[in-house]
């Protein structure tokens, strides 16, 4: 572990209450193929424990969705991954809208610091699928 | 190689016969920019030779496709990546539907074990593009 | 650095003049969360400085876009990432069309050599967003 190979792959636990757009994640072998090796979960949000450049990736699929589900809303359903605490480092890292699709998937390299908590905000009125092969979120430390 | 840097990037060889939804892959420098360094191919399916956590990624583009091609079906064309053998470890790792799009692309971290064979199942009646910059599938060992 | 951990994450600087489909990139901590550690920029294009297999990833979001923006064109807006110089190694590595979506995101493993310059060509009449969480391009050296 001293090599700094911090890594996590999470599955969706639940969505937040109505005014809370955050997705709440869970991880661990007992749950399936999710795991946390270094990073930790704090009330369903992912907290980084080692400084470095990370590859952050996410896939979110909307539940019981068709093209018409996503196209018939004024404001497209949007997913944003960002640092939500500490407040001084708050920033959006990755943002995608569903438009006429039902799945978004992306990845990016970004510097993260020990103590950064990542939030994944899903805005809109459609629910994310909890199927573990459709919705997942992970980080991988790649270099100091 | 003893570091465990197993890695592969494959290009589409062909689709299966009508009742076989699997995509058949090929790799090697003679074919272009595809390669296998550690993992191996078994009848067009990717077999893992080293235990560890892998980053699995895929992009599939449908051939001569427009939004109407994908939207006019009851059942959206779907791509699933999973462990198909050994049967005791069979599971879907990653699943995406095309809906009104013509390309899906995603990636995820997942634990894989020596002997796991990964299958990529494309359900529907549209053909995947064989262009090497449009359809590809790869894995990268990232840690034990 | 001798470990060969070359890595870069870039943000969009600007598009080219009308007959130039290339996107021009920029990177550096002063600009936000982008950085270059090994690779370098040559007139906005990313140049590789170390041989190896790289994970190349990109996300491009179209500015002020809705599904109708992308669907009402004869020729779908397309993004291609390729080696554009040296000419002897010119090849398209990754290609995606927007169809009825407003964002494309993908990644792939590919061998790159010192001196390879990567170009990202956006064809069509829609502009890419310059928001750093919507449009970004990066490479990560993963093994020799």
């Amino acid at each position: 572990e001293s090599l700094g190979w911090d890594i996590a792959e999470l599955q969706l636990n639940h969505t937040g209450p109505q005014q809370d757009p955050r997705l709440y994640w869970q991880g661990g072998p007992a749950l399936g193929r999710s795991f946390l090796r270094g990073p930790e979960l704090d009330k369903g949000q992912l907290r980084i424990r080692r400084d470095g450049i990370y590859m952050v990736h996410i896939q979110v699929t909307l539940a019981i969705c068709s093209s018409t589900s996503t196209s018939r809303h004024h404001h497209p359903t949007t997913l944003a991954v960002g640092i939500c605490s500490p407040a001084s480092r708050s920033i959006s890292l990755l943002r995608l809208s569903f438009h006429q699709g039902c799945t978004i998937a992306s990845q990016r390299l970004t510097p993260l610091a020990r103590g950064d908590t990542l939030c994944t905000n899903l805005t809109g009125t459609l629910l994310p699928s909890r199927n573990t092969d459709e919705t997942f979120f992970g980080v991988q430390w790649v270099r100091p | 190689e003893s570091l465990g840097w197993d890695i592969a990037e494959l290009q589409l060889n062909h689709t299966g016969p009508q009742q076989d939804p699997r995509l058949y892959w090929q790799g090697g420098p003679a074919l272009g920019r595809s390669f296998l360094r550690g993992p191996e191919l078994d009848k067009g399916q990717l077999r893992i030779r080293r235990d560890g956590i892998y980053m699995v990624h895929i992009q599939v583009t449908l051939a001569i496709c427009s939004s109407t091609s994908t939207s006019r079906h009851h059942h959206p064309t779907t791509l699933a990546v999973g462990i198909c053998s050994p049967a005791s470890r069979s599971i879907s790792l990653l699943r995406l539907s095309f809906h009104q799009g013509c390309t899906i692309a995603s990636q995820r971290l997942t634990p894989l074990a020596r002997g796991d064979t990964l299958c990529t199942n494309l359900t529907g009646t549209l053909l995947p593009s064989r262009n090497t910059d449009e359809t590809f599938f790869g894995v990268q060992w990232v840690r034990p | 650095e001798s470990l060969g951990w070359d890595i870069a994450e870039l943000q969009l600087n600007h598009t080219g003049p009308q007959q130039d489909p290339r996107l021009y990139w920029q990177g550096g901590p002063a600009l936000g969360r982008s950085f270059l550690r090994g690779p370098e920029l040559d007139k906005g294009q990313l140049r590789i400085r170390r041989d190896g297999i790289y994970m190349v990833h990109i996300q491009v979001t179209l500015a002020i876009c809705s599904s109708t923006s992308t669907s009402r064109h004869h020729h779908p807006t397309t993004l291609a990432v390729g080696i554009c110089s040296p000419a002897s190694r010119s090849i398209s590595l990754l290609r995606l069309s927007f169809h009825q979506g407003c964002t494309i995101a993908s990644q792939r493993l590919t061998p790159l050599a010192r001196g390879d310059t990567l170009c990202t060509n956006l064809t069509g009449t829609l502009l890419p967003s310059r928001n750093t969480d919507e449009t970004f391009f990066g490479v990560q050296w993963v093994r020799p």
Partner: antibody, heavy 120, light 111 residues
């Protein structure tokens, strides 16, 4: 076994309209596009257009826009083509055809054809 | 529209010999790693019958004496050895884009 049964021959007067049918059996009607093809006596084949019965998505050859209208009735698994303002140029055998397994425009199953004769 | 030109317009081949029919497209019908060219057989008073799809794939139930080849703009249908029942008109057809178009046909007579 897949079958496409077309309606019988038609003798019509110039300026009239007619609607021919193509009844599908042996498969799920709404799963497959139905194409229509024209063949003038002793001549080659011309694609008119297609209809997808699932959502009534249609595409026409520019040459036949305004001449042909494609519709379907899911309840009876029947596709229809209506031809209007008929002239002697419309005298031909008209075939309905079903695509093959893959959803692209090549034609694995054909109806027997409907002969249309336009004559005063 | 893509124009398909077949040659010859007609040919006569002896029983057991090889029949070769050519189809030339006005632009490439290759895309996405496939060749979108197909061949049909039509006998008098009958509907066309699919023989070959995607340039070289034999349709189920079609005898192996039929074969297709070619890519880009130049295509060939071969029948070998020719049998009596192969007397018919043969058409090429592309599906590279809409509208799909057909060649003018080649009439095969068995000597």
């Amino acid at each position: 076994e897949v079958q496409l049964q077309q309606s019988g021959p038609e003798l019509v007067k110039p300026g009239a309209s007619l609607k021919m049918s193509c009844k599908a059996s042996g498969y799920t009607f709404t799963d497959y596009v139905i194409h229509w093809v024209k063949q003038k006596p002793g001549q080659g084949l011309e694609w008119i257009g297609y209809l997808h019965p699932y959502n009534d998505d249609t595409k026409y050859n520019e040459k036949f826009k305004g001449k042909a209208t494609l519709t379907s009735d899911k309840s009876s698994s029947t596709a229809y083509m209506e031809l209007n303002s008929l002239t002697s140029e419309d005298s031909a055998v008209y075939y309905c055809a079903r695509r093959g397994y893959y959803d692209y425009a090549w034609f694995a199953d054909w109806g027997q054809g409907t002969l249309v004769t336009v004559s005063a | 529209d893509i124009v398909l030109t077949q040659s010859p317009a007609s040919l006569a081949v002896s029983l057991g010999q090889r029949a070769t029919i050519s189809c030339k497209a006005s632009k490439s019908v290759s895309a996405s790693g496939y060749t979108w060219m197909h061949w049909y057989q039509q006998k008098p008073g009958q509907a066309p019958k699919l023989l070959i799809y995607l340039a070289s794939n034999l349709e189920s139930g079609v005898p192996a004496r039929f074969s297709g080849s070619g890519s880009g703009t130049d295509f060939t249908l071969n029948i070998h050895p020719v049998e009596e029942e192969d007397a018919a008109t043969y058409y090429c057809q592309h599906s590279r884009e809409l509208p799909p178009t057909f060649g003018g046909g080649t009439k095969l007579e068995i000597k």
